[in-house]
Interface confidence: medium
């Protein structure tokens, strides 16, 4: 756009530098991008909150980059359209750098969720045994927090106040735009803080998790599984606990349900969390069985993730409390990354015969681990997770190199940059957050059941989607 | 908005030399402008005289002033200068100083002074 002024009163000819049908074209594509950011990213946000098998460490980052991602549909993306579209920023200076603060502080604060979940991969890759105990809810909020302060820290006072630090306000009337851009130091160091830093610090880490999985997988092809010694008695942790309904396994972490077929542990859906990586990236590892003799239904036990569960059939006493035999991996409660050590927990009944249908149990289900299997499927879902990584990663930097490599040229060069390409660059920062949700989200199965659930209407049972 | 004044022009005599000022107000000149003098004599179109660009300070001029004038730029005083040195006749005209804003994703603001007469006459 070319602002001239006549010479007397250097009054801004404030006139859309669109035609009609360029307006239009602008607003429904900026308008339909808007809408599938916002849709996409509650999508995320109200799955989150109403299955409680998402309710997980690794999906609380998400939580928190969706709601980031959510204001940039609502508000970012809208208004840049509307300034864009007509041709001058019609709300005045102080909407303006309000909205240029919580533009800056959210894209960057969803940079730095980006920059967490990049390093929560990294430590559960590279410190399976000791992260997982760290990696608390409690944590959690504390990173997602600083993610924000910092963001807030680096952006919001001097986007705010700058024009008081220099004693002017250098931006027309009309017109919204950072001030401090015309200061190349300050660009810099804003730009290196915001993209290149975190871009430098997201590559590194994902070389890491690269090598960390490319090396496990060459050790899975060297050891296959029918060497491996089967597991035996003298190996299992043994522990009688007694009669106690709350000791039924935890369901909030549960990933998928598979029953023991023909006595075999089926494998895990190797679709199953490709991008999440949840908790499952190292399930090839081990097989998990948990048994489960109770009272109860088929259909209503529950289990942790990586286990496989099969009813034992009911009991025949009515005061029977429920007897569980879980072999396999014990892995905090929060969520955990990677299986740490193989146990056997013997939940015991006060039923008749209790100890009985215990030691039964138990030789079945050891006698069931020893034997071999044939032979283990590629370990296809390091490659997944690490290959997701990669795409997540490039998604960021194809969206936000432009704008932050433009920004600096900007502070030598303004003229260099047509006016279009600033726009397209601008813009495709705000694409970056209608990409996260998909990115995350849509490969893992539980949120796709769940996002089908809630836009099919279909309420019933959604918390306990799997 | 900002406000371009400049000052220093007259009479002068050939061979004689005047420094043209144009001084900003509202809102400072900061580097991200570039600012040019451009000139009209009477009856004639308005020609670029010298620009003072963003990258660097660099300096431009026209063909015609090369060697005897200079441009200058002061930001503490939000002062750009025009030093005119060994003036001819056919320098007389009306000096305007103009300033121009790139904003990034919207285009370029101009800003014009109202301009100094400039006469240079035996």
């Known amino acids: 756009m070319n602002n001239s002024t006549n010479s007397s009163n250097n009054s801004l000819a404030l006139t859309s530098p669109y035609k009609t049908f360029e307006v239009v074209f602008i607003v429904l594509v900026a308008g339909s991008l808007s809408l599938v950011t916002i849709i996409g990213n509650i999508l995320v946000m109200v799955s989150i909150k109403v299955n409680r098998h998402l309710q997980t460490v690794n999906n609380y980052f998400l939580f928190s980059l969706a709601c980031a991602d959510l204001i940039i549909g609502v508000f970012s993306m809208n208004l840049y359209t509307l300034y864009t579209v007509i041709g001058y920023w019609p709300l005045g200076p102080v909407v303006c750098d309000l909205w240029l603060a919580l533009d800056y502080v959210v894209s960057n604060a969803s940079v730095m969720n980006l920059l967490i979940i990049s390093f929560d991969r990294y430590f559960c890759v590279t410190k399976p045994l000791t992260y997982p105990v760290k990696r608390t809810t409690k944590m959690a909020g504390m990173m997602i927090a600083a993610a924000w302060v910092l963001s807030f820290i680096l952006w919001a006072p001097a986007i705010l106040f700058w024009q008081f630090i220099v004693g002017v306000r250098t931006v027309e009337d009309g017109e919204c735009y950072i001030q401090f851009f015309s200061n190349a130091a300050v660009t810099f160091g804003t730009a290196i803080a915001a993209f290149y830093l975190p871009v430098i610090i997201m590559t590194v880490l994902y070389w890491h998790i690269s090598r960390a999985s490319k090396s496990r997988i060459k050790k899975d092809k060297k050891e296959p599984v029918a060497n491996q010694d089967p597991v035996s008695p003298s190996l299992v942790q043994g522990r009688i606990v007694k009669p106690n309904n709350n000791n039924m396994p935890s369901s909030d972490d549960g990933l998928e349900h598979n029953k023991i077929q023909n006595g075999k542990a089926p494998r895990d859906p190797v679709t199953e969390n490709c991008v999440q990586g949840e908790e499952k990236e190292s399930s090839n590892d081990s097989t998990s069985v948990s048994a489960v003799a109770s009272n109860m239904r088929d259909d209503e036990i529950t289990q942790d993730e990586n286990t496989v569960s099969t009813s034992l059939g009911h009991s025949k006493d009515e005061n029977s409390k429920q007897t569980c035999i879980r072999i396999g991996t014990k892995t905090p409660k929060s969520d955990s990354c990677t299986p740490t050590n193989t146990t056997v927990e013997v939940v015991g009944s006060s039923g008749q015969n209790g100890d009985e249908k215990q030691n039964i149990v138990a030789r079945k289900i050891v006698k069931m681990t020893k034997q071999p299997a044939k032979k283990k499927p590629p370990p296809s879902r390091e490659k997944k997770v690490t290959r997701t990584i990669l795409a997540i990663l490039l998604a960021f930097i194809i969206t936000w190199a432009p704008y932050n490599v433009m920004v600096l040229i900007n502070t030598f060069c303004a003229p260099c940059i047509p006016n279009t390409v600033w726009t397209i660059g601008y813009w495709l920062c705000y694409i970056n957050s209608t990409i996260n949700p998909a990115c995350y989200a849509l490969c893992n199965a539980t949120f796709k059941k769940t996002f089908k659930h809630l836009l099919m209407c279909h309420y019933k049972n959604i918390g306990a989607t799997r | 908005q900002v406000q371009l004044q400049e000052s220093g022009g007259g009479l002068v005599q050939p061979g004689g030399s005047l420094r043209l000022s144009c001084t900003a107000s509202?809102?400072?000149?900061?580097?991200?402008?570039?600012t040019t003098w451009y000139r009209q004599a009477p009856g004639k179109q308005r020609e670029l005289v010298a620009v003072?660009?963003?990258?660097?300070?660099?300096?431009n001029y026209a063909d015609s002033v090369k060697g005897r004038f200079t441009i200058s730029r002061d930001d503490a005083k939000n002062t750009v200068y025009l030093q005119m040195n060994n003036l001819k006749p056919e320098d007389t005209a009306v000096y305007y100083c103009?300033?121009?804003?790139?904003?990034?994703?919207?285009?370029?603001?101009?800003?014009w002074g109202q301009g100094t007469q400039v006469t240079v006459s035996s």
């Open positions: 103009n300033a121009v804003k790139y904003i990034p994703g919207r285009g370029e603001y101009d800003y």
């Open positions: 509202g809102r400072s000149i900061s580097n991200i402008y570039a």
């Open positions: 003072f660009g963003y990258s660097g300070g660099t300096t």
